[in-house]
Amino acid sequence: MAVTACQGLGFVVSLIGIAGIIAATCMDQWSTQDLYNNPVTAVFNYQGLWRSCVRESSGFTECRGYFTLLGLPAMLQAVRALMIVGIVLGAIGLLVSIFALKCIRIGSMEDSAKANMTLTSGIMFIVSGLCAIAGVSVFANMLVTNFWMSTANMYTGMGGMVQTVQTRYTFGAALFVGWVAGGLTLIGGVMMCIACRGLAPEETNYKAVSYHASGHSVAYKPGGFKASTGFGSNTKNKKIYDGGARTEDEVQSYPSKHDYV
């Protein structure tokens, strides 16, 4: 029951996390710029991974996609890649985890297969979450280091620089959404990995002598054997592994010089 709950909760948490990663990737407000010392034109500028926007005090808003890849910083391309990889891995992880859920029966799928699928999806969620956190952190680092503060082309007739509108770059809402979503996906992945341990069937393998005490004859076969105790999970002498030994039902006794005293 606890395993099912852990697995189910891990799936839901990861689902929310991946939805958040997708939302963050699509959002426009990765960085915001307050043009705070321009009393004439009160405009608010914000940028996403795919386009940049301007909002005026009148409420007018315009967004345009980036014209060219060449004018974009390499770091932005890296962030795009990380977020997309995170989404793809997360989506595959969700697909795998649906079939791995203990509460869903698909054909005659064994618990061991479900355990493997749960572990796979858990690892995918962890990597997906890490990709999202890394992508958002790289972008945040770009903002902190003021990567693009000196990009304006400003010239005067005297050949000197003219100082333009001061811009203050701040973290946009998408960064916080991305961090939280990445964290949730990571936590969901860890929960799936924990659930995997509970799903794996517990089998005890022994190396011992296979014997039965029917009369005076004893079948003895050297090599790897398992013990049949007559109780527990192996009452039907089911073969656990083949180490050159056979179960009692399979053993044939042939007359030998030791049979007769």
């Epitope: 710029q33 034109t41 405009v43 500028n45 940028q47 386009r51 940049s52 926007c53 301007v54 005026e56 005090s57 009148s58 007018f60 315009e62 967004c63 345009r64 996609g65 980036y66 014209f67 004018g71 974009l72 910083p73 932005l76 693009w148 990009t151 304006a152 082309n153 400003m154 333009t164 509108v165 811009t167």
Partner: nanobody, 120 residues
Framework: QVQLVESGGGLVQPGGSLRLSCAAS????????MAWVRQAPGKGLEWVSG???????NYADSVKGRFTISRDNSKNTLYLQMNSLRAEDTAVYYC??????????????WGQGTLVTVSS
């Protein structure tokens, strides 16, 4: 290659009028923000008037009611009509285009400036 070329400056008496023009090439005159900025001798930059893509028009308090900003999209030209000029309006007037959308790096383009002298 982006170019902003101002014209229309000159010597004018107090109370007179002038019309400054800013012909743009390589940049859309209906950019996110088009503005006139001036620099009086020995002083810093002062925003005069601004016109946004959305049509918002703003003026500095010192020029309200006397200056009018406008643009002609067909000619790709920005204008500043200056009436009732005063001695304190003497400055080099710069045309400024600021682009935020469609570019990751906000762009700010400036003209070479045109001198306006108000003197009797």
């Amino acid at each position: 290659q982006v170019q902003l070329v101002e014209s229309g400056g000159g010597l004018v008496q107090p109370g007179g009028s002038l019309r400054l023009s800013c012909a743009a090439s390589g940049v859309d005159i209906s950019s996110d923000v088009m503005a006139w900025v001036r620099q009086a001798p020995g002083k810093g930059l002062e925003w005069v008037s601004g016109l946004t893509r959305g049509g918002s028009i703003n003026y500095a308090d010192s020029v309200k009611g006397r200056f009018t900003i406008s643009r002609d999209n067909s000619k790709n030209t920005l204008y500043l009509q200056m009436n009732s000029l005063r001695a304190e309006d003497t400055a080099v007037y710069y045309c400024n285009a600021e682009i935020y959308t469609g570019t990751f790096y906000p762009r700010s383009y400036w003209g070479q400036g045109t001198l306006v002298t108000v003197s009797s």
